[in-house]
Protein backbone atom coordinates (compact mmCIF):
# COMPACT_ATOMS: atom_id res chain seq x y z
CA UNK A 1 0.00 0.00 0.00
CA UNK A 2 0.79 3.49 -0.64
CA UNK A 3 2.55 5.45 2.10
CA UNK A 4 1.10 8.90 3.35
CA UNK A 5 2.37 12.05 1.32
CA UNK A 6 2.02 15.50 2.52
CA UNK A 7 0.83 17.78 -0.38
CA UNK A 8 1.61 21.35 -0.38
CA UNK A 9 0.77 22.73 -3.81
CA UNK A 10 1.89 26.07 -3.57
CA UNK A 11 5.03 26.69 -4.25
CA UNK A 12 4.86 29.86 -3.15
CA UNK A 13 2.05 32.53 -2.30
CA UNK A 14 2.26 36.40 -2.48
CA UNK A 15 0.11 38.20 -0.46
CA UNK A 16 -0.52 42.18 0.50
CA UNK A 17 0.42 43.26 3.99
CA UNK A 18 -3.17 43.48 6.02
CA UNK A 19 -4.46 40.62 3.44
CA UNK A 20 -5.34 36.77 4.55
CA UNK A 21 -2.72 34.15 3.11
CA UNK A 22 -4.18 30.86 2.54
CA UNK A 23 -1.62 28.04 2.84
CA UNK A 24 -3.11 24.83 1.12
CA UNK A 25 -2.14 21.22 2.85
CA UNK A 26 -3.53 17.80 2.19
CA UNK A 27 -2.72 14.19 2.77
CA UNK A 28 -3.40 10.83 0.57
CA UNK A 29 -4.30 8.84 3.82
CA UNK A 30 -5.92 8.99 7.09
CA UNK A 31 -3.09 6.99 8.73
CA UNK A 32 -0.63 6.60 10.39
CA UNK A 33 -2.95 7.81 13.19
CA UNK A 34 -1.61 11.29 14.62
CA UNK A 35 -2.03 14.69 14.33
CA UNK A 36 -0.76 17.92 11.64
CA UNK A 37 0.93 20.79 12.92
CA UNK A 38 1.73 24.13 10.80
CA UNK A 39 5.79 25.45 11.19
CA UNK A 40 7.48 28.41 9.89
CA UNK A 41 10.70 27.32 8.80
CA UNK A 42 12.81 24.17 9.62
CA UNK A 43 14.80 22.70 12.26
CA UNK A 44 14.99 22.72 15.66
CA UNK A 45 14.20 26.34 15.73
CA UNK A 46 11.10 26.17 13.61
CA UNK A 47 7.89 28.47 14.93
CA UNK A 48 4.41 26.75 15.48
CA UNK A 49 1.89 28.05 13.55
CA UNK A 50 -1.00 26.03 14.18
CA UNK A 51 -1.63 23.12 16.46
CA UNK A 52 -4.88 22.18 17.16
CA UNK A 53 -4.35 20.28 20.15
CA UNK A 54 -2.72 23.06 22.58
CA UNK A 55 -1.67 26.69 21.66
CA UNK A 56 -3.74 29.86 21.21
CA UNK A 57 -3.21 30.89 17.48
CA UNK A 58 -6.02 34.11 16.98
CA UNK A 59 -4.97 34.79 13.68
CA UNK A 60 -4.91 31.40 12.14
CA UNK A 61 -8.50 29.15 11.09
CA UNK A 62 -8.67 26.01 9.74
CA UNK A 63 -9.94 26.10 6.21
CA UNK A 64 -11.94 22.77 5.98
CA UNK A 65 -15.18 22.64 8.15
CA UNK A 66 -14.51 21.55 12.28
CA UNK A 67 -17.39 18.81 11.60
CA UNK A 68 -15.78 17.22 8.85
CA UNK A 69 -15.84 13.41 8.41
CA UNK A 70 -12.54 11.76 7.41
CA UNK A 71 -10.80 15.32 6.95
CA UNK A 72 -7.75 15.03 4.48
CA UNK A 73 -7.46 18.64 3.76
CA UNK A 74 -5.02 21.01 6.39
CA UNK A 75 -5.10 24.35 4.89
CA UNK A 76 -4.81 27.22 7.18
CA UNK A 77 -5.55 30.58 6.88
CA UNK A 78 -3.75 33.67 8.48
CA UNK A 79 -5.35 36.62 9.17
CA UNK A 80 -3.61 40.29 9.31
CA UNK A 81 -0.53 39.24 7.15
CA UNK A 82 2.77 41.81 8.06
CA UNK A 83 5.84 41.79 6.49
CA UNK A 84 7.21 39.45 9.89
CA UNK A 85 5.31 36.49 8.43
CA UNK A 86 7.25 36.31 5.76
CA UNK A 87 9.07 32.54 5.45
CA UNK A 88 8.32 28.87 4.38
CA UNK A 89 5.65 27.31 5.94
CA UNK A 90 5.56 24.04 6.47
CA UNK A 91 2.83 21.39 7.16
CA UNK A 92 3.50 18.12 9.53
CA UNK A 93 2.32 15.34 10.01
CA UNK A 94 3.07 13.80 13.27
CA UNK A 95 2.75 9.74 14.15
CA UNK A 96 0.71 9.35 17.22
CA UNK A 97 2.99 8.24 19.91
CA UNK A 98 4.74 9.91 23.86
CA UNK A 99 5.70 12.01 22.43
CA UNK A 100 4.29 12.20 19.07
CA UNK A 101 6.78 11.91 16.10
CA UNK A 102 7.68 13.38 13.00
CA UNK A 103 6.17 11.59 10.23
CA UNK A 104 6.42 13.34 6.99
CA UNK A 105 6.58 16.99 5.56
CA UNK A 106 5.24 19.03 3.08
CA UNK A 107 7.83 20.59 0.44
CA UNK A 108 6.83 24.07 2.26
CA UNK A 109 5.20 27.13 0.71
CA UNK A 110 7.21 30.27 0.85
CA UNK A 111 5.08 32.95 1.77
CA UNK A 112 5.97 36.61 0.96
CA UNK A 113 4.39 40.01 1.56
CA UNK A 114 3.68 42.67 -0.79
CA UNK A 115 3.20 46.41 0.48
CA UNK A 116 -0.24 47.08 1.18
CA UNK A 117 -2.17 49.17 -1.54
CA UNK A 118 -2.02 52.54 -1.14
CA UNK B 1 -22.70 -1.49 3.53
CA UNK B 2 -20.31 -1.79 6.34
CA UNK B 3 -19.71 -4.95 7.84
CA UNK B 4 -17.01 -6.43 10.43
CA UNK B 5 -17.09 -10.33 11.46
CA UNK B 6 -15.52 -11.33 14.34
CA UNK B 7 -14.32 -15.02 15.10
CA UNK B 8 -12.03 -17.18 17.29
CA UNK B 9 -13.58 -16.55 20.69
CA UNK B 10 -13.74 -19.48 23.27
CA UNK B 11 -12.93 -20.85 26.09
CA UNK B 12 -8.83 -20.89 27.51
CA UNK B 13 -7.43 -21.94 30.45
CA UNK B 14 -5.57 -18.70 32.93
CA UNK B 15 -2.31 -18.53 30.76
CA UNK B 16 -3.37 -19.75 27.72
CA UNK B 17 -3.42 -18.18 24.29
CA UNK B 18 -6.04 -17.56 21.57
CA UNK B 19 -6.04 -15.50 18.20
CA UNK B 20 -9.08 -13.25 17.44
CA UNK B 21 -9.62 -11.91 13.50
CA UNK B 22 -12.19 -9.81 12.39
CA UNK B 23 -13.15 -9.91 8.56
CA UNK B 24 -14.02 -6.32 6.90
CA UNK B 25 -15.66 -5.21 3.74
CA UNK B 26 -17.83 -2.25 2.31
CA UNK B 27 -14.96 0.04 3.00
CA UNK B 28 -11.84 0.56 2.02
CA UNK B 29 -10.09 -1.16 5.14
CA UNK B 30 -6.32 -0.48 3.97
CA UNK B 31 -7.02 3.16 4.64
CA UNK B 32 -8.54 3.38 7.82
CA UNK B 33 -7.10 3.13 11.48
CA UNK B 34 -9.02 -0.24 13.39
CA UNK B 35 -9.32 -1.20 16.79
CA UNK B 36 -10.20 -3.65 19.59
CA UNK B 37 -12.88 -2.68 22.48
CA UNK B 38 -13.99 -5.19 25.01
CA UNK B 39 -16.29 -5.54 27.37
CA UNK B 40 -16.86 -7.80 30.59
CA UNK B 41 -19.93 -9.40 31.26
CA UNK B 42 -22.36 -7.41 32.77
CA UNK B 43 -19.48 -4.18 32.79
CA UNK B 44 -18.65 -1.35 30.99
CA UNK B 45 -16.40 -0.89 27.42
CA UNK B 46 -12.77 -0.81 27.59
CA UNK B 47 -10.63 -0.22 25.08
CA UNK B 48 -8.00 -2.42 23.93
CA UNK B 49 -5.85 -1.90 20.59
CA UNK B 50 -5.54 0.30 18.15
CA UNK B 51 -3.62 0.05 14.61
CA UNK B 52 -3.23 2.68 11.81
CA UNK B 53 -0.59 1.72 9.43
CA UNK B 54 2.03 -0.43 11.00
CA UNK B 55 1.33 2.22 14.57
CA UNK B 56 -0.12 0.20 16.90
CA UNK B 57 -1.38 1.12 20.41
CA UNK B 58 -2.17 -0.66 23.55
CA UNK B 59 -4.13 -0.45 26.94
CA UNK B 60 -2.03 -0.72 29.76
CA UNK B 61 -3.70 -3.57 30.94
CA UNK B 62 -2.97 -5.75 27.62
CA UNK B 63 0.28 -4.39 27.05
CA UNK B 64 2.93 -6.91 26.43
CA UNK B 65 0.35 -9.40 26.58
CA UNK B 66 -1.99 -8.98 22.89
CA UNK B 67 -0.58 -8.21 19.91
CA UNK B 68 -2.55 -6.50 17.54
CA UNK B 69 -2.42 -6.89 13.81
CA UNK B 70 -3.75 -6.26 10.30
CA UNK B 71 -3.45 -8.14 7.09
CA UNK B 72 -4.44 -5.40 4.05
CA UNK B 73 -4.43 -8.05 1.41
CA UNK B 74 -7.00 -10.16 3.26
CA UNK B 75 -9.16 -7.01 4.89
CA UNK B 76 -8.24 -8.80 8.37
CA UNK B 77 -7.77 -7.83 11.87
CA UNK B 78 -6.20 -9.81 14.35
CA UNK B 79 -5.70 -9.47 18.10
CA UNK B 80 -3.12 -12.32 19.45
CA UNK B 81 -4.03 -12.70 23.22
CA UNK B 82 -1.28 -14.56 25.41
CA UNK B 83 -0.88 -14.83 28.88
CA UNK B 84 -4.78 -14.86 29.25
CA UNK B 85 -6.05 -13.89 32.80
CA UNK B 86 -9.73 -13.87 34.36
CA UNK B 87 -10.19 -10.65 34.12
CA UNK B 88 -9.37 -11.18 30.12
CA UNK B 89 -12.57 -12.48 30.22
CA UNK B 90 -15.17 -10.71 27.81
CA UNK B 91 -16.96 -9.93 24.46
CA UNK B 92 -14.56 -8.56 22.10
CA UNK B 93 -15.32 -6.35 19.72
CA UNK B 94 -14.14 -4.95 16.76
CA UNK B 95 -14.37 -1.36 15.36
CA UNK B 96 -13.75 1.14 12.45
CA UNK B 97 -12.36 4.64 13.39
CA UNK B 98 -13.56 7.20 11.70
CA UNK B 99 -11.94 11.12 12.49
CA UNK B 100 -13.89 14.35 12.47
CA UNK B 101 -11.59 17.63 10.79
CA UNK B 102 -8.27 17.95 13.17
CA UNK B 103 -9.32 15.56 16.03
CA UNK B 104 -8.58 11.94 16.95
CA UNK B 105 -10.68 8.85 16.70
CA UNK B 106 -14.33 7.78 17.38
CA UNK B 107 -15.89 4.39 16.05
CA UNK B 108 -18.43 4.54 13.60
CA UNK B 109 -19.15 0.95 13.01
CA UNK B 110 -19.00 -2.26 15.27
CA UNK B 111 -18.77 -5.88 14.48
CA UNK B 112 -21.23 -8.01 16.56
CA UNK B 113 -18.71 -9.66 18.95
CA UNK B 114 -16.74 -12.34 20.23
CA UNK B 115 -16.72 -13.75 23.44
CA UNK B 116 -12.73 -15.00 25.15
CA UNK B 117 -14.09 -17.13 28.47
CA UNK B 118 -10.31 -17.36 30.17
CA UNK B 119 -11.24 -20.14 32.96
CA UNK B 120 -9.81 -23.41 34.49
CA UNK C 1 -5.53 9.37 31.32
CA UNK C 2 -8.50 11.79 31.02
CA UNK C 3 -12.05 9.42 33.20
CA UNK C 4 -15.20 10.03 32.42
CA UNK C 5 -18.09 10.09 34.27
CA UNK C 6 -21.17 9.39 33.65
CA UNK C 7 -24.72 10.61 35.77
CA UNK C 8 -26.96 8.74 36.54
CA UNK C 9 -25.42 5.08 36.67
CA UNK C 10 -29.63 4.28 35.75
CA UNK C 11 -32.58 6.71 34.76
CA UNK C 12 -36.41 5.86 34.90
CA UNK C 13 -38.24 7.02 32.53
CA UNK C 14 -41.69 6.61 30.93
CA UNK C 15 -41.94 6.21 26.84
CA UNK C 16 -42.52 9.30 25.37
CA UNK C 17 -41.29 11.62 28.04
CA UNK C 18 -37.80 13.19 27.72
CA UNK C 19 -34.12 11.80 29.25
CA UNK C 20 -31.32 13.79 30.08
CA UNK C 21 -28.18 12.18 31.34
CA UNK C 22 -24.39 13.83 31.41
CA UNK C 23 -21.30 12.84 31.25
CA UNK C 24 -18.33 14.76 33.10
CA UNK C 25 -15.00 13.98 32.03
CA UNK C 26 -11.34 14.83 34.46
CA UNK C 27 -10.06 17.56 31.68
CA UNK C 28 -11.26 19.70 28.83
CA UNK C 29 -11.56 17.59 25.84
CA UNK C 30 -12.70 20.37 23.74
CA UNK C 31 -15.20 19.22 21.62
CA UNK C 32 -14.01 15.38 20.97
CA UNK C 33 -16.71 13.58 22.75
CA UNK C 34 -18.71 10.46 21.23
CA UNK C 35 -22.27 8.84 22.26
CA UNK C 36 -22.94 5.60 21.94
CA UNK C 37 -26.14 3.28 22.15
CA UNK C 38 -26.08 0.09 23.26
CA UNK C 39 -29.74 -2.55 23.29
CA UNK C 40 -29.24 -5.34 25.63
CA UNK C 41 -27.30 -8.64 23.28
CA UNK C 42 -26.22 -6.12 21.04
CA UNK C 43 -22.88 -3.83 20.00
CA UNK C 44 -22.52 -0.21 20.34
CA UNK C 45 -23.69 2.26 18.02
CA UNK C 46 -22.96 5.35 17.12
CA UNK C 47 -25.05 8.36 17.97
CA UNK C 48 -23.30 11.56 18.47
CA UNK C 49 -19.87 12.58 17.11
CA UNK C 50 -17.57 16.39 17.66
CA UNK C 51 -20.15 16.35 21.45
CA UNK C 52 -23.08 17.33 19.15
CA UNK C 53 -23.28 15.93 15.31
CA UNK C 54 -25.59 13.51 14.85
CA UNK C 55 -24.78 10.76 12.78
CA UNK C 56 -26.07 9.60 9.30
CA UNK C 57 -29.56 8.01 10.33
CA UNK C 58 -30.25 8.88 13.90
CA UNK C 59 -33.52 9.99 14.41
CA UNK C 60 -33.66 13.94 15.62
CA UNK C 61 -34.70 12.71 18.71
CA UNK C 62 -31.66 12.24 20.43
CA UNK C 63 -29.32 15.35 21.14
CA UNK C 64 -25.82 15.96 22.46
CA UNK C 65 -24.68 19.53 24.03
CA UNK C 66 -21.54 20.80 25.86
CA UNK C 67 -18.09 21.22 25.71
CA UNK C 68 -15.01 21.27 27.85
CA UNK C 69 -15.54 19.20 30.82
CA UNK C 70 -19.67 18.83 30.69
CA UNK C 71 -21.41 16.98 28.08
CA UNK C 72 -25.13 16.08 28.11
CA UNK C 73 -27.54 13.81 25.69
CA UNK C 74 -30.68 14.45 25.68
CA UNK C 75 -33.46 11.76 24.13
CA UNK C 76 -36.58 13.69 23.11
CA UNK C 77 -40.01 11.76 23.45
CA UNK C 78 -38.37 8.24 24.41
CA UNK C 79 -39.45 5.48 21.89
CA UNK C 80 -39.07 1.32 22.97
CA UNK C 81 -36.21 1.32 20.94
CA UNK C 82 -34.50 4.06 23.07
CA UNK C 83 -34.14 1.55 26.53
CA UNK C 84 -30.81 0.46 26.42
CA UNK C 85 -27.06 1.64 28.09
CA UNK C 86 -25.23 5.10 26.67
CA UNK C 87 -21.87 5.50 27.11
CA UNK C 88 -19.50 8.44 26.05
CA UNK C 89 -16.29 8.33 24.72
CA UNK C 90 -13.33 10.82 24.38
CA UNK C 91 -10.83 11.22 21.83
CA UNK C 92 -9.17 14.31 22.82
CA UNK C 93 -6.17 12.67 24.45
CA UNK C 94 -4.93 8.96 23.95
CA UNK C 95 -3.80 6.43 24.34
CA UNK C 96 -6.03 5.03 26.21
CA UNK C 97 -9.32 6.19 24.56
CA UNK C 98 -11.77 6.10 27.07
CA UNK C 99 -15.38 5.41 28.20
CA UNK C 100 -18.03 6.91 31.10
CA UNK C 101 -19.40 3.53 33.22
CA UNK C 102 -22.75 4.06 31.32
CA UNK C 103 -26.17 4.92 31.73
CA UNK C 104 -29.11 2.58 31.57
CA UNK C 105 -32.07 4.16 30.74
CA UNK C 106 -34.90 1.71 31.94
CA UNK C 107 -38.99 1.62 31.54
CA UNK C 108 -40.33 3.56 34.35
Known amino acids: EEELQVIQPDKSVSVAAGESAILHCTVTSLIPVGPIQWFRGAGPARELIYNQKEGHFPRVTTVSESTKRENMDFSISISNITPADAGTYYCVKFRKGSPDTEFKSGAGTELSVRAKPS | DVQLLESGGGVVQPGGSLRLSCAAS????????VTWVRQAPGEGLEWVSTIGSGDTYYADSVKGRFTISRDNSKNTLYLQMNSLRAEDTAVYYC???????????????WGLGTLVTVSS | EIVLTQSPATLSVSPGERATFSCRASQNVKNDLAWYQQRPGQAPRLLIYAARIRETGIPERFSGSGSGTEFTLTITSLQSEDFAVYYCQQYYDWPPFTFGGGTKVEIK
Open chain 2, 26 to 33: GFSFSNFA
Open chain 2, 95 to 109: AKDSTVSWSGDFFDY
